[in-house]
Amino acid sequence: HKCDITLQEIIKTLNSLTEQKTLCTELTVTDIFAASKNTTEKETFCRAATVLRQFYSHHEKDTRCLGATAQQFHRHKQLIRFLKRLDRNLWGLAGLNSCPVKEANQSTLENFLERLKTIMREKYSKCSS
């Protein structure tokens, strides 16, 4: 079957996100991928969205992330916009209202996004073949 347009948007947004480093991409998030053996695909998407929402809710106006220069501030705003777009599209793919995120493991946001990108590219290659 054809790949969902949302999936293409997610990969595109992840490509943009992983290209840019900001003051906040080294901050840690819950690593939902560390032990996701018994998790459905929809649950994974839902939990990834939950992690992203937690991150931008906490750090949107975080002075550590805003930086001291206009360029740092601008980059941080762009990061938040991309994370919100990603969150929105992941919720759309998941089709679930809520999901628990209880893992103790942590990873940097940067690594989390790279892992998510790998998963999404794998999904895309399956649905486009």
């Epitope: 948007e9 595109k12 938040i80 919100k84 929105r88 919720w91």
Partner: antibody
């Protein structure tokens, strides 16, 4: 300061074409998604189209799909709307708008609008 | 497309009044809702985004709440400059849609 200025509006006959421009200043166009929103006389707001920051993704309202094309020239900091096969119901004030600083697909900066009248 | 229904379509109020405008979505849109104010002959102005976040420079008498399908815009104490038309907008998915507007008039 941050500003959007539309141009290119006017009166045109049904079936003809028109190209609107939106010049951005005070920010880098290539960092933001950009939209066109229109408002028919005495009516509410209608979203028309969006182009992503890098120009690679565009979406359109069903009412203009196949007739309107959004594009951007980031080197000129300018957004465009090519309108073909115009109809009377396309008569409206056309606004270009920038996506929000903190959220995608909302509009935090608007132009002053340019009037498009489609009439024979 | 997601439909947004605002109520009331118009209302009359006095300076100092507390006013609430509601916006209902035809399906769940999480918190992907914004509110705008528009005065005659002018472009709209963003007031609230993400359902409840106040846009920079907007007076604190404006507030937004809600999630899912039901949202409200509240003006805690109307000022003379607040008489205008208000629109809600969803950005949960394309096509982006607006409510039909609520016209706020002086009583």
């Amino acid at each position: 300061q941050v500003q959007l200025v539309e141009s290119g509006g006017g009166m045109v006959q049904p079936g003809r074409s028109l190209r609107l421009s939106c010049a951005a200043s005070g920010f880098t166009l290539s960092s933001y998604g950009m939209h066109w929103v229109r408002q028919a006389p005495g009516k509410g707001l209608e979203w028309v189209t969006v182009i992503w920051y890098d120009g690679n993704n565009q979406y359109y309202a069903d009412s203009v799909k196949g007739r309107f094309t959004i594009s951007r020239d980031n080197s000129k900091n300018t957004l465009y709307l090519q309108m073909n096969s115009l109809r009377a119901e396309d008569t409206a004030v056309y606004y270009c708008a920038r996506e929000g600083s903190w959220s995608p697909d909302i509009f935090d900066i608007w132009g002053q609008g340019t009037m498009v009248t489609v009439s024979s | 497309a997601i439909q947004l229904t605002q109520s009331p379509s118009s209302l009359s109020a006095s300076v100092g009044d507390r006013v609430t405008i509601t916006c209902r979505a035809s399906q769940g849109i999480s918190s992907y809702l914004a509110w705008y104010q528009q005065k005659p002959g002018k472009a709209p102005k963003l007031l609230i985004y993400d359902a409840s976040s106040l846009e920079s420079g907007v007076p604190s008498r404006f507030s937004g709440s809600g999630s899912g399908t039901d949202f409200t815009l509240t003006i805690s104490s109307l000022q003379p400059e607040d008489f205008a038309t208000y629109y809600c907008q969803q950005f949960n998915s394309y096509p982006i849609t607006f409510g039909q507007g609520t016209r706020l008039e002086i009583k």
